[in-house]
């Protein structure tokens, strides 16, 4: 099939006091090969500080996956989710509050 770029969605949720969990979800993409990682100041976080979901079919002939990490509240500006898929890339910031979700298609 032809390339379908992912939709990328970054959310945040309260973790423990002083911390938040940020989750980056990529969905509706094809083929299944994708790089999805959290960066701090542009540098990829180590693997032991991130959790990844499996790359799974979403039922439409495309795939979905996610990556999450825990960060200190107040340091959100330092963190971005980096996505690379089929030769294209994008960077996604952490939204400023719980009610703000960012959805982006990338071509």
């Amino acid at each position: 099939g032809s390339t379908v770029p992912p939709m990328v969605n970054v959310t945040r949720s309260e973790a423990s006091e002083g911390n938040i969990t940020v989750t980056c979800r990529a969905s509706s993409f094809y083929p299944r090969n994708i790089i999805l990682t959290w960066r701090q100041d542009g540098v990829s976080l180590s693997h032991d500080t991130q959790q990844w979901g499996d790359v799974l079919p979403d039922g439409n002939g495309t795939y979905q996956t996610w990556v999450a990490t825990r960060i200190c509240r107040g340091e959100e500006q330092r963190f971005t989710c980096y996505m690379e898929h089929s030769g294209n890339h994008s960077t996604h910031p952490v939204p400023s509050g719980n009610s703000h979700h960012h959805h982006h298609h990338h071509h």
Partner: antibody, heavy 118, light 108 residues
Framework: EIQLVQSGAEVKKPGSSVKVSCKPS????????IYWVRQAPGQGLEWIGY????????IYNQQFKDRATLTVDKSTSTAYMELSSLRSEDTAVYYC???????????WGQGTLVTVSS | EIVLTQSPATLSLSPGERATLSCSAS???????LHWYQQKPGQAPRLLIY???NLASGIPARFSGSGSGTDFTLTISSLEPEDFAVYYC?????????FGQGTKVEIK
Amino acid sequence: EIQLVQSGAEVKKPGSSVKVSCKPSGYAFTSNNIYWVRQAPGQGLEWIGYIDPYIGRIIYNQQFKDRATLTVDKSTSTAYMELSSLRSEDTAVYYCSRSGERSNFDYWGQGTLVTVSS
Amino acid sequence: EIVLTQSPATLSLSPGERATLSCSASSSISSNYLHWYQQKPGQAPRLLIYRTSNLASGIPARFSGSGSGTDFTLTISSLEPEDFAVYYCQQGGSLPLTFGQGTKVEIK
């Protein structure tokens, strides 16, 4: 091959501004942050700030946030650092660098000497 | 601000000798955020070791790094003529990003 090529040396008067350019090549310009660092003669390295070329986010060292301005021109894949209200203490070599996969500064420009003198 | 203090300021050694450079942080740093750079006169710094102990691409195995918490070490097992330079540690854990003041390794 990844390279970052900077603009040439500048001589400036106190109170004026300087704008240094940095043109990376060998990778996708918007995929990595561009950092700026300076080094006064015979001194150590001092971080000025960085810019994410994809989203345009800028993080400054507080010490420079009132005088430094970081920008990018995505159409030419060029990053810029402008420093205003120059004083003699700003005489230094200014470096651009690229954020790496596992470290803050993995490739560096050749440096631009800025001399501030009346 | 995390202050990195490097010692000694100058290390005078002969080719073939072992060099041990120290970097002490004012606050604890995760090993993922401590890096070393080498700078020769008239040149830009270059990445030597990332994340405390990992050799950057093209760096010979005589270089090694170790440490944790507030104390980190760069070791050159047997100095080659091209190793005489200034070495900087750098932390990326908290803003502002900071460098040590450098250790100059000079020929004795």
